[in-house]
Interface confidence: low
């Protein structure tokens, strides 16, 4: 029988009446157009909704927008369009919401053609009030808040000027011209690239990378011949053109660009690209595109300095620059990532790593599923997950995989069971152990979301027809109840719940359509009465993460330590609550070869934990570039995985001898870098 339809499923008592009392409809006095929704702050209950409607006239497009505000998680909305003087807001800039709980909001208005500059509306009280400010420039990008100080904003103008405000957009100053890309770093530092000659496009590969640490009073050129740059974790990356040809290489800095090292990654040609897939303070996942229009490349994982890289995964699917990759960080369990590879026969297969890229494997076939038509052997196949690539290919996949840090172990995704991703209509699968095992959760495509830190999962069927039914589960997707939230079905457009999965409210968005008109409508359902009581100690059970062999003393050891979590029992119907904190107990493991990656020039043969020398480098001295000097590497082939906390046990030694030779890098060495003040 389908999941949730067997006899073992107990029904939640009187849930229809409880939910009916907590279902709030809001019909927006709006023609349909488009709608965007933003949460302002964390646990504030404040939601801003911007609806826009374009009326194409013969000569121009006339636009109209409305702004609504809720302060009760979407149960009621108030039209606050008058607070922004009934101005048409530009949706391409979205609503710029300030970091943390600053309560700041910036809306960018549409202005008439001849105006001197743009116009913004600013609020610093969670959108209770707005101040109109005329800008001395036309913005090209959304206002970007400094992560450290929400009063500091930066923006690029349509004329490529870099503008900064120190008082939350009240006054603006152009601190540099001819800017291509600008990003906030740490400590209110701004990094940006500039062009000298024609334009960003014309100077690609000849850009300069600049830094200002005092909001534009003084500058330092920290790189030349730049193609692009990126920030990830504590790493600053730049791709730099080589002297002699059109190839470029990645350089990395961990000191805000004062010193640079050449990353031990392959160089790429004009048509190729690098992409930072994920980064934290320990390490980086870097994708390097293959030559030619292959649609795939190689994932490399870095050491703790971002300099020495190990090959992690071949034939990694990544279509084009800025294109699609399925690379997904499973945030509900440490060390877990899922992505897709393009196999030799051009089929797409899902791979998972549980140890931060150390080794990859196929996803285990769900117990309650049969292999589909893609499987050569009907008894042996894997689960393949639909993510960004499938969505871009317009497969019947309404949502990417979902996991939440505070819903430990839970991963929800669309998938198919076979030898490769299938083009057929997918089903929804759930893992409750971070991706080790999977179960079919729902038949056919659905939208889904996690509430109350995993205490409730909500889903809505993905249908072309109007809908009026929502499904929910209180036992991590084993059993499902259905609730008819309205008599009159709506064309469904999206599920919205507060980011962080701590809320117990879900908003169902859609529109009603009649012969003459269509209107936006939202239904907000509060599940608080379904989970009647607060969870107690007896509702939780101890769970060892990454456990694959309970007999083994080192069971659960990943990246040098194991973690025991307190997890809600599936049978407990209670509230984790908004203040729920994941309880975990770490313990250090003894080191084994699994705690070491293969060093530069070494690789791990399949199904072997030993690192062996790459044949093409056998007997060669290994040289690499560090802080502008050439280093000589003496190694037995191992290096500790960044973030690995193991102690004792196996301990392969690694030495680095300094040859004190200059690198053959064309990058500006620190002593050549120049500073200037405004």
């Amino acid at each position: 029988s389908a999941p949730g339809e067997d006899e073992e499923c107990g029904r939640v008592r009187d849930f229809v009446a409880k939910l009916a009392n907590n279902t709030h409809q809001h019909v927006f006095d709006d023609l349909r157009g488009s709608v965007s929704l933003s949460w302002v702050g964390d646990s504030t209950g404040v939601i801003l909704v911007l609806t826009t409607f374009h009326v194409p006239l013969v000569i121009m497009t006339f636009g109209q927008s409305k702004l609504y505000r809720s302060e009760d998680y979407g149960k009621n909305f108030k039209d606050i369009t008058d607070l922004i003087n009934n101005t048409f807001i530009r949706t391409e800039f979205g609503m710029a919401i300030g970091p943390e709980n600053s309560g700041k909001v910036v809306l960018t208005a549409e202005v008439s053609g001849g105006s001197r500059g743009g116009r913004i509306f600013r609020s610093s009280d969670f959108a209770k009030n707005f101040v109109q400010t005329d800008l001395p420039f036309h913005p090209l990008t959304q206002m970007m808040y400094s992560p450290q100080n929400s009063d500091y904003l930066l923006a690029l103008s349509t004329e490529n000027g870099l503008w900064v405000s120190k008082n939350f957009g009240g006054k603006w100053e152009e601190i540099h011209k001819a800017v291509c890309l600008a990003k906030w770093g740490s400590d209110n530092t701004i990094f940006f690239t500039t062009y000298a000659n024609g334009s960003c496009k014309a100077d690609l590969g000849a850009l300069e990378l600049w830094r200002t640490s005092d909001l534009g009073k003084s500058f330092k050129t920290i790189g030349v011949k730049i193609y692009s740059f990126g920030l990830g974790g504590r790493f600053l990356f730049a791709s730099v053109m080589a002297d002699k040809d059109t190839t470029r290489r990645i350089h990395v800095s961990t000191d805000q660009g004062d010193t640079w090292s050449m990353a031990q990654l392959p160089s790429v040609g004009q048509e190729q690209f690098y992409s930072i897939l994920a980064a934290n303070d320990d390490m980086v996942f870097m994708h390097v595109d293959e030559p030619g229009d292959t649609g795939f490349g190689t994932i490399f994982t870095s050491d703790d300095r971002g300099i020495v890289y190990s090959k992690s995964l071949d034939r990694h699917l990544y279509t084009t620059t800025g294109g699609e990759t399925d690379f997904t960080n499973v945030t509900s369990l440490r060390g877990v990532y899922i992505t897709s590879v393009l196999s030799e026969d051009n089929s797409i297969q899902t791979m998972i790593t549980f140890d931060q890229g150390g080794r990859w494997t196929h996803l285990r076939k769900p117990e309650n599923s049969e292999c589909d038509a893609t499987a050569k052997n009907k008894n042996e196949c894997s689960l393949h997950i639909h993510a960004s690539y499938s969505i871009s290919q317009k497969l019947n996949v309404p949502m990417a995989p979902l996991s939440e840090p505070n819903a430990v172990g839970i991963v929800i995704a669309h998938g198919s069971v076979g030898d490769a991703i299938s083009v057929m209509v997918p089903d929804v699968y759930i893992s409750d152990d971070g991706g080790y095992s999977w179960t079919k959760m729902l038949e056919g495509p659905h939208y889904y979301t996690i509430l109350d830190s995993g205490g409730i999962i909500v889903a809505i069927e993905h249908s072309s027809r109007p809908i009026n039914v929502i499904k929910f589960s209180t036992d991590e997707g084993q059993c499902w109840q259905t609730y008819t939230f309205t008599r009159d079905p709506i064309y469904f457009t999206g599920l919205a719940s507060e980011p962080g999965a701590r809320s117990m409210n879900i908003s169902i968005w859609g529109f009603t359509e009649s012969f003459l008109t269509s209107q936006w409508v939202s239904y907000t359902i509060d599940f608080k009465d379904i989970l009647e009581r607060n969870c107690e100690e007896k509702d939780y059970t101890i769970w060892l993460a990454h456990s694959t062999d309970p007999e083994d003393y080192e069971d659960g050891c990943i990246l040098g330590y194991k973690e025991q979590f307190l997890r809600l029992r599936k049978s407990s119907v209670c509230q984790n609550g908004r203040d729920y904190v994941v309880t975990k107990q770490p313990s250090i493991c003894l080191c084994s070869l699994e705690d070491f990656l293969c060093d530069f020039g070494y690789y791990r043969p399949e199904n072997d934990s030993k690192c062996v020398e790459q044949p093409e480098l056998k007997g060669h001295d290994l040289e690499f570039c560090l802080y502008g000097r050439e280093e000589h590497l003496t190694t037995n082939g191992y290096r500790k995985i960044p973030g690995d906390k193991c102690q004792g046990g196996v301990n392969p030694v690694r030495e680095v001898k300094d040859l004190k030779k200059k690198c053959t890098s064309n990058f500006l060495s620190p002593e050549k870098q120049n500073s200037k003040s405004n």
């Epitope: 089929s347 797409i348 290919q393 317009k394 497969l395 490769a420 083009v423 057929m424 249908s463 072309s464």
Partner: antibody, heavy 129, light 107 residues
Framework: QVQLVQSGAEVKKPGASVKVSCKAS????????MSWVRQAPGQGLEWMGI????????SYAQKFQGRVTMTRDTSTSTVYMELSSLRSEDTAVYYC??????????????????????WGQGTTVTVSS | EIVMTQSPATLSVSPGERATLSCRAS??????LAWYQQKPGQAPRLLIY???TRATGIPARFSGSGSGTEFTLTISSLQSEDFAVYYC?????????FGGGTKVEIK
């Protein structure tokens, strides 16, 4: 206008292979899947499989697994269907058909099946000793 | 695989009359269903997709209804050019499958 043009009729001996081509024009080749459907004389329609022109990934009906191979050449906007180990019951008209396969064009909400909206003229394959 | 069953196998109707064709799926196919018309010596032509939406250029006399397992194609007033074989096809789960067809002939 959008059209699919298939290769000409073939006569094959049992045990041989046949490769039918289908050239697409009038739309972005990589934006839609291509299905292959066959029809034996006096019989109904039978779906053989589908190919995604972007990556070349395929899904075949169980009945044809191991005997059919679908490929594509994006440079010429052409898909190919090769059927091996032919037997007399493979005598049929073979059609290629553009198949959105769940691709949403404009549906008010959600994606759903849009049907095989453009068909080739058909290729008659006769298997006879 | 999902089995599609069409009924009747043959339907004799006079021009101008209404024709109702049925298609049943062995399990739910939601609204992932299409109807095709095929005339002798021609390739099939898409009539209805998404169970109820007329394809481009298809006259309003053709309509589709149903969802789940029971579907109907209705031709409100048969014209001479409508006499043909009609097939339903599901695309809910692979492999795609067709019904055996209903032949609409002149009474």
């Amino acid at each position: 206008q959008v059209q699919l043009v298939q290769s000409g009729a073939e006569v094959k001996k049992p045990g041989a292979s046949v490769k039918v081509s289908c050239k697409a024009s009038g739309y972005t080749f990589t934006s839609r899947y291509m299905s292959w459907v066959r029809q034996a004389p006096g019989q109904g329609l039978e779906w053989m499989g589908i190919i995604n022109p972007v990556g070349g990934s395929t899904s075949y009906a169980q009945k044809f697994q191991g005997r059919v191979t679908m490929t594509r050449d994006t440079s010429t906007s052409t898909v190919y269907m090769e059927l091996s180990s032919l037997r007399s019951e493979d005598t049929a008209v073979y059609y290629c058909a553009r198949d959105p396969s769940g691709i949403a064009l404009a549906g008010p909400a959600g994606r759903y099946y849009y049907g095989m909206d453009v068909w080739g003229q058909g290729t008659t394959v006769t298997v006879s000793s | 695989e999902i089995v599609m069953t069409q009924s009747p196998a043959t339907l004799s109707v006079s021009p101008g009359e209404r024709a109702t064709l049925s298609c049943r799926a062995s399990q739910s196919v939601s609204s992932n269903l299409a109807w095709y018309q095929q005339k002798p010596g021609q390739a099939p032509r898409l009539l209805i997709y998404g169970a109820s939406t007329r394809a481009t250029g298809i006259p309003a006399r053709f309509s589709g209804s149903g969802s789940g397992t029971e579907f109907t194609l209705t031709i409100s007033s048969l014209q001479s050019e409508d006499f043909a074989v009609y097939y339903c096809q599901q695309a809910r789960l692979g492999p795609w499958t067709f019904g055996g067809g209903t032949k609409v002939e002149i009474k």
